[in-house]
């Protein structure tokens, strides 16, 4: 199955990165997983993963960084709290689970860059 | 000429890039010329340029909001007061001016990102 | 070299259990969620189990209620107790976590 995810993404000076990940479905899926992994340095990391019910809200755990909404198969993906360190790779795995057949696609990744911001001036 | 600069720098949250562009000499050139290319929506504008004598500093005009240095066939460039919407791809042109023959090289571009900063709160 | 085993697999008869494992090497279980899938001979793949990585787990409706997935972080490996085996159980079982599946084990429900 067919993931299809932006080459690159800049994170905003809030650290804050938005991206839409979009599957070209095969059937009529009513439960779908999206799942964001981070590679870098050849290692690949779970950042965050969600099921949800078509036409649903997407739920993140409560400490998940990130958010999402979806919109026919569309997901509109917004990862928050990153600093310099977590620019890397993020792949979006987008997972048909239920009816049968299960299929599984997989994104080329969206690389996304973060600059950390400079600190205010103290105020005096 | 083979000219290599790196595929993509970020800029600092200060709106500072930096990267190196090196040449493979084909001569023993004693002045050469460098100029900064930027190549934005298949529009491409000089950002800055400099001469310079082997084994001495580069020179951009006073108002230049580049800098650089050499050591050998590598230039070291620096621009600075870079904006969001400064974002583009930067093309070094390595020319040797003298002695003949003239040689000319272009590189591939560096993308350079630059994300704004947030303002900082007012200090009451 | 990230690395994803299964086993357990087997032949028993309707009503009968069997625990499947699957090991990991190369990175760690827990930070990831892990899914059990299964393929029927001559059918697509089917998903069984989910658990995250919160440790929350979910099933398919055609195992629940007979079906746990589970995993011991400190032997890095993850499990799927089947109880109340039906022939329609029967088919390779395979582990997937992040970008790994490992290569299957087989199960087959038969009198």
């Known amino acids: 199955m067919h993931v299809a995810q932006p080459a690159v993404v800049l994170a905003s000076s809030r650290g804050i990165a938005s991206f839409v990940c979009e599957y070209a479905s095969p059937g009529k899926a009513t439960e779908v997983r999206v799942t964001v992994l981070r590679q870098a340095d050849s290692q690949v990391t779970e950042v965050c993963a969600a099921t949800y019910m078509m036409g649903n809200e997407l739920t993140f755990l409560d400490d998940s960084i990130c958010t999402g909404t979806s919109s026919g198969n569309q997901v509109n993906l917004t990862i928050q709290g990153l600093r310099a360190m977590d620019t890397g790779l993020y792949i979006c795995k987008v997972e048909l689970m239920y009816p049968p057949p299960y299929y599984l696609g997989i994104g080329n990744g969206t690389q996304i860059y973060v600059i950390d911001p400079e600190p205010c001036p103290d105020s005096d | 000429m083979h000219v290599a600069q790196p595929a993509v720098v970020l800029a600092s949250s200060r709106g500072i890039a930096s990267f190196v562009c090196e040449y493979a000499s084909p001569g023993k050139a004693t002045e050469v010329r460098v100029t900064v290319l930027r190549q934005a929506d298949s529009q491409v504008t000089e950002v800055c340029a400099a001469t310079y004598m082997m084994g001495n500093e580069l020179t951009f005009l006073d108002d230049s909001i580049c800098t650089g240095t050499s050591s050998g066939n590598q230039v070291n460039l620096t621009i600075q007061g870079l904006r969001a919407m400064d974002t583009g791809l930067y093309i070094c042109k390595v020319e040797l001016m003298y002695p003949p023959p003239y040689y000319l090289g272009i590189g591939n571009g560096t993308q350079i990102y630059v994300i704004d900063p947030e303002p900082c709160p007012d200090s009451d | 070299q990230v690395q994803l085993q299964e086993s357990g697999g087997g032949l028993v008869q309707p009503g009968g259990s069997l625990r499947l494992s699957c090991a990991a090497s190369?990175?760690?279980?827990?930070?990831?969620?892990m899914t059990w899938l299964r393929q029927a001979p001559g059918k697509g793949l089917e998903w069984v189990s989910t658990i995250n990585s919160g440790g929350s787990t979910s099933y398919a409706d055609s195992v629940k209620g007979r079906f746990a997935i589970s995993r011991d972080n400190a032997k890095n490996t993850l499990y799927l107790q089947l109880n109340s085996l039906e022939i329609e159980d029967t088919g390779m079982y395979y582990c997937?976590?992040?970008?790994?599946r490992g290569q299957g084990t087989q199960v087959t429900v038969s009198s």
């Open positions: 190369g990175f760690t279980l827990s930070s990831y969620s």
């Open positions: 997937q976590g992040g970008l790994t």
